[in-house]
Amino acid sequence: NKILVKQSPMLVAYDNAVNLSCKYSYNLFSREFRASLHKGLDSAVEVCVVYGNYSQQLQVYSKTGFNCDGKLGNESVTFYLQNLYVNQTDIYFCKIEVMYPPPYLDNEKSNGTIIHVKGKHLCPSPLFPGPSKP
């Protein structure tokens, strides 16, 4: 028995920040779980972890240097990534493990979300074209 995960196929991070919502076919209320976001086709980089416990405050952390926050819904976890770099454009996968109460459950691998990071390009504005050559 596996949890199904739905993610947007693609998101664009215009201001080097993005909200990625992971929607699960499972109610996380009163469960102890570990939701995580992984970068790359091989999911090699664990970008962010949201640890939920029935008795404690939500714990959100990254051990890989990402600036992340997390928000919990009944059947979703939303990861808020900030300060993304253009070279972090990649495919990102949501993962969920429900530990308590048993039985342990995890998810079928999702299709992932391509996050396209558009950097802040310092282009001259048409109204303020900048200094012109004499």
Epitope: R34, N53, E97, M99, Y100, P101, P102, P103, Y104, D106
Partner: antibody, heavy 120, light 111 residues
Framework: EVQLVESGGGLVQPGGSLRLSCAAS??????????VSWIRQAPGKGLEWIGS???????YYNPSLKSRVTISRDNSKNTLYLQLNSLRAEDTAVYYC????????????WGQGTLVTVSS | DIQLTQSPSSLSASVGDRVTITCRAS??????????LHWYQQKPGKAPKLLIY???SLQSGVPSRFSGSGSGTDFTLTISSLQPEDFATYYC?????????FGQGTKVEIK
Amino acid sequence: EVQLVESGGGLVQPGGSLRLSCAASGFSLSTSGVGVSWIRQAPGKGLEWIGSIYHSGSTYYNPSLKSRVTISRDNSKNTLYLQLNSLRAEDTAVYYCARYEYDYYAFDYWGQGTLVTVSS
Amino acid sequence: DIQLTQSPSSLSASVGDRVTITCRASQSVDFYGISFLHWYQQKPGKAPKLLIYAASSLQSGVPSRFSGSGSGTDFTLTISSLQPEDFATYYCQQSYRTPRTFGQGTKVEIK
């Protein structure tokens, strides 16, 4: 046949660290459906759960020990490890590794245990 | 944390006696009709051995004289006819919540 064999116990100085090993055979530590925990038992006392590792590599710890303990594994050796830091006399115990299945989390197979004595 | 309290802490019994040990949890360990409460036997110098899982299911290879019952917060381990090899310490354990906790143990001694 499922087997768990602990090693690495012995005499350790207070303030020191220990690293115990648990070699598993008869099943794979990375196969979905089973996890392994470390459990300890002080001389003449009851059983205390230290923490668990799931097939995915996710770890869970007893909050009373969390700041001092790390559970890890080497899939190529099918071996589990327990690192415990800042040891004190009350950490003197027999340390067991035990397997559990994902249905009920009951510990169905146990190692023979390894004794750790913390003393100067 | 879920506290498990076993009673009695120790008991003396004779071969052939019916023995009952109780385990009370500080909160329910039931979830969707399953009780996440297990019983172990431990002999001196040996590792614990699983006897009963999920309150009443007999672990493979365990003699049928061992049985478990109960739900919610109150559980019982029964040995219908005590055998010489049954003199040991018995522990209950819950796996409903983390941290997983054990009862303090019940020592069954020869009368």
